[in-house]
């Protein structure tokens, strides 16, 4: 009975996600056979989050809306380890929107999920950000500095990175 009700709960949870994510890749968390963490296929997983690299070129606002439709946000980077994981899946000749913007042009940077912007955990390229009209952040590769952030115009189409919490079933 217990296993049956657990299975029913799992199925109903899976149905919630089916509209946007017809396929999930799940792994067993720890030793308990009943705890599974999942990411949509073909998203990648790191710690408690799932990541998707969107190769379509869109403006920042459209990129965020696109992530939102999938139950995600543009990526919020919280640690160097997280950034190191993300860049493994990026192409060096491309730029990708982050979930970081300064809509007022006053250098009050804000993350899309309201995570407080912490100047000590930022990875701007040297000399960046450098233009009050460039109100959205990308991550890109510079041969001198490897991967880092740059401010650019929000309306300029770029690739993007979506992030969502893992689905636990």
């Amino acid at each position: 009975n217990f296993m049956y009700s657990k299975t029913v709960k799992r199925l109903s949870k899976l149905r919630e996600y089916q509209q946007y994510h017809p396929s999930l890749t799940c792994v067993m968390e720890g030793k308990d056979i009943e705890d599974w963490s999942c990411c949509p296929t073909p998203w990648t997983s790191f710690q408690s989050s799932c990541y998707f690299i969107s190769t379509g070129m869109q403006s920042w606002t459209k990129s965020q809306k696109n992530c939102s439709v999938m139950g995600a946000d543009l990526v919020v980077i919280n640690t160097r380890e997280e950034q190191d994981f993300i860049i493994q899946n990026l192409k060096r000749n491309s730029s990708y929107f982050l979930g970081l913007s300064d809509p007022g042009g006053r250098r009050h940077w804000q993350w899309v999920d309201q995570t407080p912007y912490n100047e000590n955990v930022t990875f701007w390229h040297s000399g960046e950000p450098n233009n009050l009209d460039e109100r959205c952040a990308i991550i890109n590769f510079r041969s001198s500095e490897e991967w880092g952030w740059n401010d650019i115009h929000c309306h300029v189409p770029q690739k993007s990175i979506c992030k969502m919490k893992k689905i636990y079933i």
């Epitope: 403006s59 459209k62 965020q64 009209d133 115009h153 309306h155």
Partner: antibody, heavy 121, light 111 residues
Framework: EVQLVESGGGLVKPGGSLRLSCAAS????????MSWVRQAPGKGLEWVST????????YYPDSVKGRFTISRDNAKNSLYLQMNSLRAEDTAVYYC??????????????WGQGTTVTVSS | DIVLTQSPASLAVSPGQRATITCRAS??????????MHWYQQKPGQPPKLLIY???NLESGVPARFSGSGSGTDFTLTINPVEANDAANYYC?????????FGGGTKVEIK
């Protein structure tokens, strides 16, 4: 007072070239993105190209990509549009416009009087 | 590209009356309460002039007879009351993404 003055228009044969200029005054030119917008006779407005304040970004619609090049000289407070391989459908009044950023986008807050380009054999 | 459709293409209004122009976008030009739709007036032989930015903000020096509203895909420019020198073409423009696009224009004539 903000002023934008275009020049360089004229009559040119199909396949020919023209270079338009826009002289800016009354504001810190180097701090603003700039655009060219055109208007064919009796028609509406069509955006032609954009250049960012720092010259790091240029953008064109497919209709002019590869034929037109926007550039700027911040030391001379000047904006340029080099137009090559001109076609009859490029005939229009060409306006230089200043961009003012607002939130995630921008609008054109000042426009020049325009310069007329006629492409005809 | 985002397509902007203006209606009507033309309208004739008597002085003192209200003129209403609408602009419909092929997709939303709003994001988190910011509406990136702008309105311009163009009189014959003159360049366009900014009237309204971000859907409802009146540009400095523009009479309060002009107002804008709307969100998402549907926006309106209202002139109330209309005066004789309001005869012009009016254009909407979006800037939420490149390329920036303009509506086809609405010609306002004064009866």
């Amino acid at each position: 007072e903000v002023q934008l003055v275009e020049s360089g228009g004229g009559l040119v044969k199909p396949g020919g070239s023209l270079r338009l200029s826009c002289a800016a005054s009354g504001f810190t030119f180097s701090s603003y993105g700039m655009s060219w917008v055109r208007q064919a006779p009796g028609k509406g407005l069509e955006w032609v190209s954009t250049i960012s304040s720092g010259d790091s970004y240029t953008y064109y619609p497919d209709s002019v990509k590869g034929r037109f090049t926007i550039s700027r000289d911040n030391a001379k407070n000047s904006l340029y549009l080099q137009m090559n391989s001109l076609r009859a459908e490029d005939t229009a009044v060409y306006y230089c416009a200043r961009q003012l950023y607002y939130s995630y986008g921008y609008y054109f807050d000042y426009w020049g009087q325009g310069t007329t380009v006629t492409v005809s054999s | 590209d985002i397509v902007l459709t203006q209606s009507p293409a033309s309208l004739a209004v008597s002085p003192g009356q209200r003129a209403t122009i609408t602009c419909r976008a092929s997709e939303s030009v709003s994001f988190h309460g910011t509406h990136l739709m702008h309105w311009y007036q163009q009189k014959p032989g003159q360049p366009p002039k900014l009237l309204i930015y971000a859907a409802s903000n009146l540009e400095s020096g523009v009479p309060a007879r002009f107002s804008g509203s709307g969100s998402g895909t549907d926006f309106t420019l209202t002139i109330n009351p209309v005066e004789a020198n309001d005869a012009a073409n009016y254009y909407c423009q979006q800037s939420i993404e490149d390329p920036p696009t303009f509506g086809g224009g609405t010609k306002v004539e004064i009866k």
